[in-house]
Interface confidence: low
């Protein structure tokens, strides 16, 4: 009966860096001739291993093929890389000049499992303000097989992406994923996180996460109020300028007297609120006896390179 070449596994999956065995058994020792392993078919097929004296780095025979009774022509490929993916054929030749191919196994497809890179989440270059819609993009690369799941979350709530693409669309040794999600910012988002979660067969149910802290992408402008306290003595008036619920910390506060700069504050001791925003209070003591006329005091707050917010307060002359 005609020799049969049997490759029992139709496919094997192996993690990048690991080794895999490709099994091949023959049903007969005859006719005499070499057995060779190829990746691919046709003119472009690549010789992977030949059971002769040639040396093939990373590929070794599993059993002693020199024994006359041996019918096992399995090979082990070590330190597998994504480039090793493909269909491998165990091929029997009949000795001659040249050798002629007489039978091939059905092929074993090698799927190389490569882990996705840790997801990287990028957001807008400029900070957004509450009620503004901003886009975040998550990217991960180098994974195989192509099947992958990507989910977005904000504070534990799943978000629906605008689009998710896996490239390339055709067969390849490894793949990349990119996904974009739109988030509507709100003033409570300073402590919020946007999380991109990637699940893949190689990750053993422990998805990879990329995190964007919304504190890096949001600007909450302060509410500014100027109030006059009850005078502590006949000659003194206390003015308070309060900047409330702002983020980030970058704040400059200037007191003006009838339009002229009177004092520059560079806040040091900011109060942090539970929602992550800050408050700052500046006290300004006015010597009322020095003012016969009404005086307009201005508190000017510059926050995070934004246009100044000004609040005026008139202190009546004595």
């Amino acid at each position: 009966t005609e020799v049969k070449v049997i490759q029992p596994e139709k496919s094997v999956s192996v993690a990048a860096g690991d080794s895999t065995v490709l099994n091949c058994t023959l049903t007969s020792l005859l006719p005499v001739g070499p057995i060779r392993w190829y990746r691919g078919v046709g003119q472009s097929r690549q010789l992977i291993y030949s059971f002769t004296t040639e040396h093939f780095p990373r590929v070794t025979n599993v059993s002693d093929a020199t024994k006359r009774s041996n019918l096992d022509f399995s090979i082990r490929i070590s330190n597998v890389t994504p480039e090793d993916a493909g269909t491998y054929y165990c091929v029997k030749f009949q000795r001659g000049s040249p050798d002629t191919e007489i039978q091939s196994g059905g092929g074993t497809e090698v799927y190389v499992l490569a882990k996705p890179s840790p997801p990287e989440v990028s957001g807008p270059a400029d900070r957004g303000i509450p009620d503004q819609k901003v886009n975040f993009t998550c990217k991960s690369h180098g994974f195989s097989p192509r099947n992958i799941t990507l989910k977005w979350f904000k504070d534990g709530q799943e978000l629906h992406p605008l689009e998710t693409t896996v490239n390339p669309s055709g067969k390849n040794v490894s793949y990349n994923i990119s996904s974009t999600v739109r988030v509507v910012l709100n003033s409570m988002d300073v402590n919020s996180k946007v999380i991109c979660e990637v699940a893949h067969i190689t990750l053993d149910r422990s998805p990879l996460r990329g995190i964007a802290n919304l504190s890096n992408f949001i600007r909450v402008s302060p509410t500014v109020k100027v109030t006059q306290q009850s005078p502590t003595s006949m000659n003194q008036v206390n003015l308070t300028c309060r900047a409330e619920r702002f983020y980030p910390e970058d704040l400059q506060l200037i007191w003006l007297e009838n339009g002229n700069v009177s004092r520059n504050d560079t806040p040091k001791n900011l109060t942090k609120n539970t929602d992550g925003t800050y408050n700052y209070t500046s006290l300004f003591l006015v010597n009322s006896s020095a003012h016969r006329e009404d005086v307009v005091f201005t508190c000017q707050v510059k926050h995070d390179q934004q246009p100044a917010i000004t609040r005026n307060h008139t202190v009546l002359g004595f």
Epitope: T1, K4, I6, K10, S11, T25, D72, G106, E109
Partner: antibody
């Protein structure tokens, strides 16, 4: 025409080893081109592949049973056999042997033998 | 392991009806799928191999199609002798796994 026939005890005590043999008639087990398989079916349930052997050596087991299963072939008797150790009531099933062609499925089956695990 | 999900789990149809059973694999198995028929108290019988090839001696009213993850088994005109449970089985990845079965009855 190839035929398969399972044989072995119908009752096995818990913790003991279940041993079954499949005799091939009408063809040689060592003619090549086929795997010789064991499959079981729990009462009223679906089919579970246990493992398979090729006459010249390669053996494949279901990982869920691998620690307890041994499949062997005896070409001189044209038989292959199954041993399942440390059995429990959960191993009560109809056990089938079958011939599997490389690309033609399990085309020949034995009629099946019922094995009950009970003390 | 590859999970094979068969649906429906049971169906009732009239003689002459066209009956369709689907089988879904948990990942791509190319066309490495077989279909079997099992009558009560009997061993399974191979009907279709490699997803669409009719096994020797099987009537042409049985057919199979599909590739990748989704497969279909069809009986073009149900006959009384077709009362049985039908199973799909993948052989792309070890261990070979079967679907849960579809019990076909006559109305």
């Amino acid at each position: 025409q190839v035929q398969l026939q399972e044989s072995g005890p119908g009752l096995v005590k818990p913790s003991q080893t279940l041993s079954l043999t499949c005799t091939v008639s009408g063809g040689s087990i060592s003619s090549g081109g086929y795997y010789w398989s064991w499959i079981r079916q729990h009462p009223g349930k679906g089919l579970e592949w246990i493992g398979a052997i090729y006459y010249s050596g390669p053996i494949y087991y279901n990982p869920s049973l691998k620690s307890r299963v041994t499949i062997s072939v005896d070409t001189s008797k044209n038989q292959f056999s199954l041993k399942l150790s440390s059995v429990t009531a959960a191993d009560t099933a109809v056990y089938y042997c079958a011939r599997e062609g490389y690309h033609s499925g399990m085309d020949v089956w034995g009629q099946g033998t019922t094995v009950t695990v009970s003390s | 392991d590859i999970q094979m999900t068969q649906s429906p789990s049971s169906l009732s149809a009239s003689v002459g009806d066209r009956v369709t059973i689907t089988c879904q694999a948990s990942q791509d198995i190319s066309n490495y799928l077989n279909w079997y028929q099992q009558k009560p108290g009997k061993a399974p019988k191979l009907l279709i191999y490699d997803a669409s090839n009719l096994a020797t001696g099987v009537p042409s009213r049985f057919s199979g199609s599909g590739s990748g993850t989704d497969f279909t088994f069809t009986i073009s005109s149900l006959q009384p002798e077709d009362i049985a449970t039908y199973y799909c089985q993948q052989f792309a990845y070890l261990p070979w796994t079967f679907g849960g079965g579809t019990k076909v009855e006559i109305k």
